[in-house]
């Protein structure tokens, strides 16, 4: 990535890190309004299996691992990128390394969910307070989950699917911050680990993933009112370890692995027409990226 100043633009889709032959340090941003990609400041340490989120206009890269020819190191790191200066700075690390982590943001606090450290699959969850630069453990999930999809809806944190070390999962659970407790919710129709999970129009979407046999292109959404999962249109590509985000009322999925190829494909879902379309390609194929969208 270049180290010059990033142009001051509106809402961008950021993709950080990922994996292709080894963990990557790329930070790139896609501007859906004109279809261009920006090459931004590299992560200080390459990582895949990380998660991305935005708090207060700053992009955070959370967890993952550095899988390189020199070795394989799971990451407890939290790093903060300032789009105005195009610079990364380290923040307080998590209590444990978390590869294939999920993250969500509630009231400006980052929740780091599950992930793995070596052969340990975490059910632990911790919360970061940016103003104090501190992490604190909260109640653990009811299930160990790596490759977990995390989303926030109505100030509740949902952990969806993943892998407990023995089985890929279709189960999902919900965290209530006021009670500091987790409760199971209706299981998905499909086992999904490494799915893309996000919130759009009061529904939680789970896209793609891996069911223990194959990569998936199916997509389902959870209606919190009816507590049911319903299939919507499938993606054009099967993919696991994909990136996902929502931009202006549409879902974007980025990259992933289809069982043969590291995808550069970016697809966009329009809920009004229940259709997926290919909108762009990343500059190279990769899986295990961290993705987030800047605020206005």
């Amino acid at each position: 990535g270049s180290m010059g100043h990033a142009p001051k633009v509106g809402r961008l889709i950021y993709t950080a890190g990922g994996y292709f032959r080894q963990s990557l340090s790329y930070l790139e941003a896609y501007n859906p309004s004109d279809g261009t990609w920006l090459d931004l400041a590299d992560l200080q340490v390459p990582r895949s299996g990380l998660a991305g989120c935005v708090v207060g206009g700053l992009l955070y890269a959370v967890g993952g691992r550095n899988n390189s020819p020199d070795g394989n190191t799971d990451s407890s790191a939290l790093d903060c990128y300032n789009p105005m200066t195009n610079q990364w700075s380290p923040c307080a690390p998590m209590s444990v390394p978390r590869n294939r982590i999920g993250v969500g943001v509630i009231d400006g606090h980052i929740y780091a969910v599950g992930g793995s450290h070596g052969c340990i699959h975490h059910n632990s969850v911790e919360r970061y307070e940016p103003e104090r630069d501190e992490w604190h453990l909260v109640a653990p999930m009811l299930t160990r989950r790596i490759g977990v999809g995390v989303a926030v809806l109505n100030r509740l944190l949902y952990a969806v699917g993943g892998f407990d070390g023995t089985n890929r999962l279709n189960s999902a659970e919900c965290y209530y911050p006021e009670r500091n407790e987790w409760r199971m919710i209706t299981a998905m129709n499909t086992i999904r680990s490494g799915a893309g999970v996000c919130v759009l129009h009061n529904c939680i979407y789970a896209a793609g993933g891996y069911d223990g046999q194959d990569q998936l292109n199916s997509v389902e959404r959870y209606d919190v009112e009816t507590e049911t999962w319903t299939f919507v249109a499938p993606m054009k590509h099967r993919r696991s370890a994909l990136g996902i985000t929502v931009h202006q009322g549409r879902i974007y999925v980025l990259g992933g692995y289809d069982g043969h190829t590291f995808l550069d494909s970016v697809e966009c879902y329009d809920p009004d027409t229940d259709t997926w379309s290919e909108v762009t390609r990343m500059t190279s194929g990769r899986s295990g990226v961290g993705v987030a969208v800047t605020m206005e």
């Epitope: 490494g194 046999q213 069982g259």
Partner: antibody, heavy 120, light 107 residues
Framework: EVQLVESGGGLVQPGGSLRLSCAAS????????IHWVRQAPGKGLEWVAS????????LYAKSVAGRFTISADTSKNTAYLQMNSLRAEDTAVYYC?????????????WGQGTLVTVSS | DIQMTQSPSSLSASVGDRVTITCRAS??????VAWYQQKPGKAPKLLIY???SLYSGVPSRFSGSRSGTDFTLTISSLQPEDFATYYC?????????FGQGTKVEIK
């Protein structure tokens, strides 16, 4: 019946290349991590490389990193080990093995092995 | 890398004997240890996974146990087909590493 059959071994000069194949039957390689493990003549077992079917990520022993590449073709239900810049110390029987479960990372099915000899 | 120090490197025993093989990890590996049996010219066979779980189809005379970073494979009553080399393997930390092997020979 689960079976793994390696092929592609042989005699190669130092600095040369070989591509080993591991043909699986009785299970889908898309459902398990596949490992390569080697055993030098009269010596013990050494883990070499593995590939994760979910993320596509690969791992390598330091002794082979940058020279060996593991891959899988799910349409052929076959895994591969591309070995470049071979050295005398790479001489060994190479086994492919199926991971029993990620949590345990133990290999429950192994191929019969293929001998790679690196010598001038 | 985590070292798995296996002992003894060889032992002589008779049919019906109780045989114990030990592996000591250089640091904590939790219970992520497997044991294999290998006969000359053959591939290894999985006996024990997760330190103490008997793999399907393996005779119950084989057992595994853990005490901290020490792992033990026990054959309660040695049978003629058990004369082989045995290896431990840790998969807790990258890279996975094996013990150097224990050859069980006929006394």
């Amino acid at each position: 019946e689960v079976q793994l059959v390696e092929s592609g071994g042989g005699l190669v000069q130092p600095g040369g290349s070989l591509r080993l194949s591991c043909a699986a039957s009785g299970f889908a390689i898309s459902a398990s991590s596949i490992h390569w493990v080697r055993q030098a003549p009269g010596k013990g077992l050494e883990w070499v490389a593995s590939i994760d079917p979910e993320t596509g990520e690969t791992l390598y022993a330091k002794s082979v990193a940058g020279r060996f590449t593991i891959s899988a073709d799910t349409s052929k239900n076959t895994a591969y080990l591309q070995m470049n810049s071979l050295r005398a110390e790479d001489t060994a029987v190479y086994y492919c093995a199926r991971e029993y479960a990620w949590w345990y990372a133990a290999a429950d099915y192994w191929g019969q092995g293929t001998l790679v000899t690196v010598s001038s | 890398d985590i070292q798995m120090t296996q002992s003894p490197s060889s032992l002589s025993a008779s049919v019906g004997d109780r045989v114990t093989i030990t592996c000591r990890a250089s640091q904590s590996v939790s219970s992520a240890v497997a044991w294999y049996q290998q006969k000359p010219g053959k591939a290894p066979k999985l006996l024990i996974y997760s330190a103490s779980s008997l793999y399907s189809g393996v005779p119950s005379r084989f057992s595994g146990s853990r005490s901290g970073t020490d792992f033990t494979l026990t054959i309660s009553s040695l049978q003629p087909e058990d004369f082989a080399t045995y290896y431990c393997q840790q998969s807790y930390s990258f890279p996975s590493t094996f013990g150097q092997g224990t050859k069980v020979e006929i006394k």
